[in-house]
Structures are given as C-alpha cells and as structure tokens.
C-alpha cells in the first residue's frame, strides 16, 4: 500500500475546503497549530483545525445527517402520502356514487318520494364521509336517522297518498312507530351491520396511513444529539484537520457511528414491522361486508328491498299506525293497494362490468406489497445511510475517526475512542421523547388494527340472528356479495374503475334504477296504484 500523503504544511487545502462551508477564513489557521482547545478532533500532532471550525463541522455534520435521513425516507414518505390522498379521494368517489345510485333508485322507483328522499339520502352520505374522516358519529344513529326520516314520507306519499294536510303533523309519531313496529323489518339492522363494519375498517385504514405519514415525518425531522454530532464530525471531518481531504471513512466505522446516532430511531423498527403486518392483515380482510366499496355501492338495493318490505306489509301497518298515530276523525282513504307491477318487469339499467379495471381492493394490495418492501426500513437505516454517504469499500485504507488505517478494526477503533466518549452510553440513553411518543402511537394503531373484528382466514363470520337473516353472509360468490341487484346489475367486483372519475361518475339520471315509465310487457300487479276506495284510519 502507498504511504499516507503528508499533512498539508500550509493548511491551504483545508482553508479552501472550509471556505465552502463558511465564507471567510478568519477561523482557519494558516499553518498547523497544536490544537489544544479542540474537543472532538483530538490531535495526535499539529492540526489545521480550530475550535470554531470544529463547531461549524458539528453543525454541518448534523445537517448532513438530517438530509441523508430525509432522502432515505423520501420514497417511503411519498408512497404513503400519495396513497393516503388517493384512498381518501377514492372513498369520497365511492360515497358520491353510492349517493347517486340511491337517489336514482328513488327517482326511478318512487318518484313521489324524491324531493325529501334526496335530502335524507344526502344527509346520510354526508355523515358517512365525515365518519370515514374520523368524525365522532355513531353509525347506528346514522342508519336509524335515515329510516326514521324516510318512513313518514313513505307513509304519507306511498301508503296514504290521499291523506289530508291536517293529518300531516304526525311525523314525530311515525318516526317513533318506525322503530316500535319494526316497520322496515330487519333491513335497518342488516345495513347497520354492513355499514358499521365496512366504515370502521375504512376509517382505521385511513388512520393507519396518516399515522404512517406522521411516523416518517417524525423520524424525518429528528434533531440529532450533540454526542451524535461529535461522532459524525469525527467520522466525516476530523480527517480534514490532518489535511487528509480525499480519505473516506471506513464502512464498518460508519455503521458503528450510525447505529449509535440512530439507536433511538431503530427502536421504532419492531413497531413499524408490526404496523405493516397488521395493516396487511386488515387489507386482506377488506372484502364483502368489510369492503366499503362493496357495501356502499350495494346500499341502494338493500334500501329498495326495505321499502318493498314496508309495501308488502302496508295493510297491517296502516291499520296499526292509524290507531297509534290517530287523529280526531277517522275516515277511510284506502282499503287496499293496487299492485303496480304484476307482469311489468321494469326497465333495468346495467352498469358496465369492467373486468380488468384497477379497483380499490387491488390498489390496497399493491400498496401493501410496496410497504412490505420497507418493512426493515428502520433497522436498515444505519446501513442505508452509510451506503449513501462516502465510505471506503472493503474497509481498506480508510479513516477510523482518529487516523488513516489500512484495515478497519472495530475493537481498535473503540479503544481509541474510549477517552473521547462512550458509544455504549450513547446507545443506552434511550429514544428521544418524540420517538417515544411515535412508538406509543404505533402501539395504539397496531392494537386497533389487531382488534378489528375482521374475518380470519377469509372465512365469513355468520351472524345468524333469531330473525332469520345472516348479516355477515351474502352467498357463495365473493365478488357479488352486496348489490348486484335488479336495480342496475352492478357487479361488485371491480365496481369502481379506480379514479377513472369521468368515465364513471354517475348523474342521478343515469344511475341504476327501474323506471316507472317502463314499457309494460304485461300488466303487472301493484297494490299501490290506481287506487279505489282505500282505507286510512287517519283523518
């Protein structure tokens, strides 16, 4: 090996280099000095560094370290930020489509309900959006409010369209009767189950992504300790004091220094790994009633079923409600419904089923795959930073913090450093308060992710209840669990052409629905139209 270059007799190279860091040369000795006041770059002989230069090197070293850390996390940070924004927007699109589908169902099947129904549907979906974004709203209350609001309109417009104005102040009574008489049967309960499960999962998914951003931002902007600044200075700049401008730190030495500097950050690793694996588990479970796209885009059809149920039981209900919400005079307004549709199969609008479009579900899986490539991000940080800063390959002819060596020996380096400060002590200090805080947040989200009531191993939970409906099961075809109805034949698989907004955005006029202006094939029965002498005990 060639001998090390002799020290710069005039400190010229050091001066020109230092001037790039700090304009002006007042701190740089013209010729080597004893350097007895130095605290970091402890000289073995004359040195081209002063105390002020040392301080500047420490500051620069810490700034360099922060920049390296930020560039190390840039790709990961962008991945999570971009996806959090994309998913938030996508969920908003799903909510908007779901609202349009529901409005279209009312417009096409129950035009007499539309003005009020649109309002109630709008309020419901606004609450859905707010809930996803973290608002403190109870999903059961949202669903109850929707049905409480709809029933008086259904009763006065569909079941008793002949009601005089004097009888229209019974809304409060009708709202109460809706729950007491289970007017909509088990449908509200089914919707509560599906909506609460799917929205809960969606909400925690977004929360987890946002916390991911917070974790990266926290570690991205860490301020490194003075001890770390000293170690970095010794590694990157102390060689300059000896005029060794072209010498690179030893790779092994860099790893030791980085592990010391990042001891606190690396403590995040365990919780970060758990975060990604828990998020993966959540995403794997986001299907059927745990998939908001599936649930919300199929809601209109369940609401339609619930109205049909009311209509089928309208005779009994009208009598009971007539007694319950009775007004002074009783007069018969209707004695039967005239079935509107015996033999009319109403016009069906089909939403194109696009097999290969990107869906929310595939996008989620893709995100998880990318995140998994960052699962060792924190444990690998020291190595990553060393590989992205100048280090000597093969640990030969490199700087070990004190001198130029032919081969790096960790033991020798530690012995040489023990009088300067203890690496072990630095490690034992424990994480910064901000790091401890973010670890607590990760623990909390991991707990939430784990305790989500998700189906394990893709087996559906069958909440078979005594009324005889299975709130968790929608048949054998996973892709068509909820929705897929006669109101529009929406295929739930690949329903949302991912962010292809313009191609897919539904107007109320073109959402799935059955038009009442359908051409009658036959003369379908309806108990609701062409009313004759029909009963209502309400005045």
């Amino acid at each position: 090996q060639p001998p090390p270059p002799p020290p710069d007799a005039t400190c010229h190279q050091v001066r020109s280099f230092f001037q790039r860091l700090q304009p002006g040369l007042k701190w740089v000795p013209e010729t080597p000095v004893p350097g007895s006041d130095l605290q970091v770059c402890l000289p073995k002989g004359p040195t081209c560094c002063s105390r002020k230069m040392e301080e500047k090197y420490q500051l620069t070293a810490r700034l360099n370290m922060e920049q390296l850390l930020q560039s190390a996390s840039m790709e990961l940070k962008f991945l999570i930020i971009q996806n959090a924004a994309v998913f938030q927007e996508a969920f908003e699109i799903v909510v908007r489509h779901a609202k349009n589908y529901t409005n279209a169902m009312f417009k096409n099947n129950y035009p007499s309900l539309t003005p009020q129904a649109f309002e109630f549907v709008g309020e419901f979906f606004t609450d859905v959006s707010l809930y996803i974004l973290g608002s403190d709203i109870n999903v059961d209350d949202m669903v109850n409010e929707l049905f409480d609001s709809l029933f008086p309109v259904i009763y006065t417009q569909l079941m008793n369209p002949g009601l005089p104005d004097s009888a229209l102040d019974i809304n409060e009574c009708l709202r109460g009767a809706r729950r007491d008489l289970k007017v909509f049967g088990n449908f509200p309960k089914l919707i509560m189950t599906q909506v609460s499960k799917s929205l809960q999962v969606t909400r925690i998914f977004l929360q987890a992504l946002n916390l991911g951003i917070e974790v990266i931002n926290t570690t991205d902007h860490l301020k490194f300790s003075k001890d770390c600044g000293r170690m970095l200075t010794r590694m990157w700049y102390c060689s300059y004091c000896q005029g060794l401008m072209m010498v690179k730190p030893c790779g092994g030495y860099c790893n030791v220094v980085m592990q010391g500097c990042m001891a606190g950050v690396v403590e995040i690793d365990k919780y970060w790994r758990e975060y990604i694996l828990s998020l993966e588990e959540l995403v794997n479970g986001m299907y059927r009633i745990y998939d908001m796209e599936n649930v919300l885009l199929g809601l209109f059809s369940t609401i339609h079923d619930s109205i049909q149920y009311v209509q089928k039981n309208a005779g009994k209900l009208t009598t009971t409600i007539g007694k319950l919400c009775a007004h002074s005079q009783q007069r018969q307004y209707r004695s039967a419904y005239y079935p509107e549709d015996l033999f009319i199969d109403k016009k069906v609008l089909k939403v194109a089923h696009v097999e290969h479009e990107e869906t929310l579900s595939s996008r989620r899986r893709e995100l998880i795959q990318k995140l998994k490539s960052f699962i060792s991000f924190y444990s690998a940080l020291p190595g990553y930073i060393c590989s992205h800063s100048p280090v000597a390959e093969n640990d030969t002819l490199c700087w070990n913090g004190q001198e130029l060596v032919e081969r790096y020996s960790q033991k020798a380096a530690r012995n040489g450093m023990k009088n300067q400060f203890n690496l072990h002590e630095l490690k034992m200090k424990g994480p910064e308060p901000v790091v401890s805080q973010i670890i607590d947040k990760l623990k909390h989200i991991n707990q939430l992710l784990r305790t989500m009531s998700m189906p394990k191993g893709r087996v559906l939970d069958k909440n078979l209840d005594e009324e005889g409906f299975e709130s968790g099961d929608c048949g054998d075809d996973e892709d068509e669990c909820i929705g897929g109805s006669g109101d529009g034949m929406i295929k739930v698989k690949n329903q949302l052409r991912f962010l292809a907004e313009l191609a897919y955005d539904l107007d109320v006029d073109d959402a799935p629905g059955n038009s009442q202006q359908a051409t009658p094939k036959d003369n379908e029965i309806s108990t609701f139209h062409n009313l004759g002498n029909v009963h209502s005990p309400l005045k």
Epitope: G185, N186, F187, L190, S301, T302, H304, D305, Q308, Y309, Q311, K312, N313, A314, G315, K316, L317, T319, S335, A336, Y337, Y338, P339, E340, D341, L342, F343, D345, K346, V348, G468, F469, E470, D473, C474, G475, I482, G483, G484, S485, G486, D487, M489, N514, E524, I525, S526, T527, F528, G532, V534, H535
Partner: antibody, heavy 119, light 107 residues
Framework: QVQLQQSGAELARPGASVKLSCRAS????????ISWMMQRTGQGLEWIGE????????YYNEKFKGKATLTADKSSSTAYMQLSSLTSEDSAVYFC????????????WGQGTLVTVSA | DIQMTQSPASLSASVGETVTITCRTS??????LAWYQQKQGKSPQLLVY???TLPEGVPSRFSGSGSGTQFSLKINSLQPEDFGSYYC?????????FGGGTKLEIK
Amino acid sequence: QVQLQQSGAELARPGASVKLSCRASGYTFTSYGISWMMQRTGQGLEWIGEIYPRSGITYYNEKFKGKATLTADKSSSTAYMQLSSLTSEDSAVYFCARDVSDGYLFPYWGQGTLVTVSA
Amino acid sequence: DIQMTQSPASLSASVGETVTITCRTSENIYSYLAWYQQKQGKSPQLLVYNAKTLPEGVPSRFSGSGSGTQFSLKINSLQPEDFGSYYCQHHYGTPPTFGGGTKLEIK
C-alpha cells in the same frame, strides 16, 4: 316470460336433510322476493317464508323456523330451501313462488317438488 | 296469524251453473284478499287480488267481492276447465295465510 323451474322429487330418510332448488328466468331475479309454500296431500297451502335475493334477508313463518333455511345464489338466479331433521310430517309438495314488489301476491309459481320422507 | 276459513270445503256443480265460494278472516283485512285456482297435480294460479281485481288473462266470469272479514268468489257459467280447488289468501302482511280450500267437482 317469467318461469320458476324446481328440482325433481326427493325421497329421504327420517332425520335426513334435503335441499330443493328453484331456478328463476324471464325477469330480474333480485328485484322480487321468492316465497316457499308447503302443501300436504289433499290439504291447503302454508307459507314457509321468503327471501329477498338482493340482500339475502329472509323471513320465516314461526312454524317453520329451524325446519327450513332459505338461501339464494344471484349468479345462477336460483333460490334454495333446505329442510332439516325430516319427519313423515314433512312429506308434501313444496312450491316456490315469486311475489310482486309491494304485496304478498304470487302470480308466478314453480311446478312443485314432491318430498317423501320414509324409513 | 290471521286465520282463513273457507266454505264449503267441497261442492259439486254442472257446466253452465253459477257457484259462490266464501272466505272469512279472523280479523279485518280490508280488501287485502286474493283467490287462487289449483288443478290436480299443478301449481296454483292467481285469479283475483285486492278482493275484486282480476289480473290480465283471467276470464270475466270470475268475480270477487267483500271487504273487512267476509269475502266471496263467484264463478258465472261454469266451464269444464273451472273444476279444481280454490284457495283464498290474505296479502295484508306477513305471514300471508291461506284458507283450507274448496274443491269444486263436476256433478
């Protein structure tokens, strides 16, 4: 035109289960409820229950809870009824019928499936 | 559940005659009543709904009447194809129930 095609006759042992099918065609399967009726030889009709194929919600006549289980497969437009713990009392013809969207009226019926329970 | 009582349980009549079958309900069902005809070995067919409305395709010799708890089905000028069993059914709400049936035979 609307058609409901039921599966063939079943002979079963007491205690066994049978699953009857009813394949719908000629209309949008999910737009209407499917009800099932029982008719013992020479007797009247009894409503067993109904399923809303769109949401999978089922309603049962109290008398048949635990005896009948209704399901539907939207992809094949088929409704199913499983009868369990069969006894000779369950020997009957079982009909599926399509209702109208707003009443318990049955304008369309399957041809019926005879179930015979015998040791 | 609403009980449906049909009478008579059976009757014999000749082609060309007029017959009336009655149905009584255990509670007021207003006009929520349907009638079905069933021939031997076949499935029932809807004849009347809302007590008196005939679906398209049902001959006008069939007519329904009544409301509340008393209902009747009248067949004018009996035709050979009219023989079979007749059932009333309420469509007032869940569960729908059927009468025991009336068997109409050729005299």
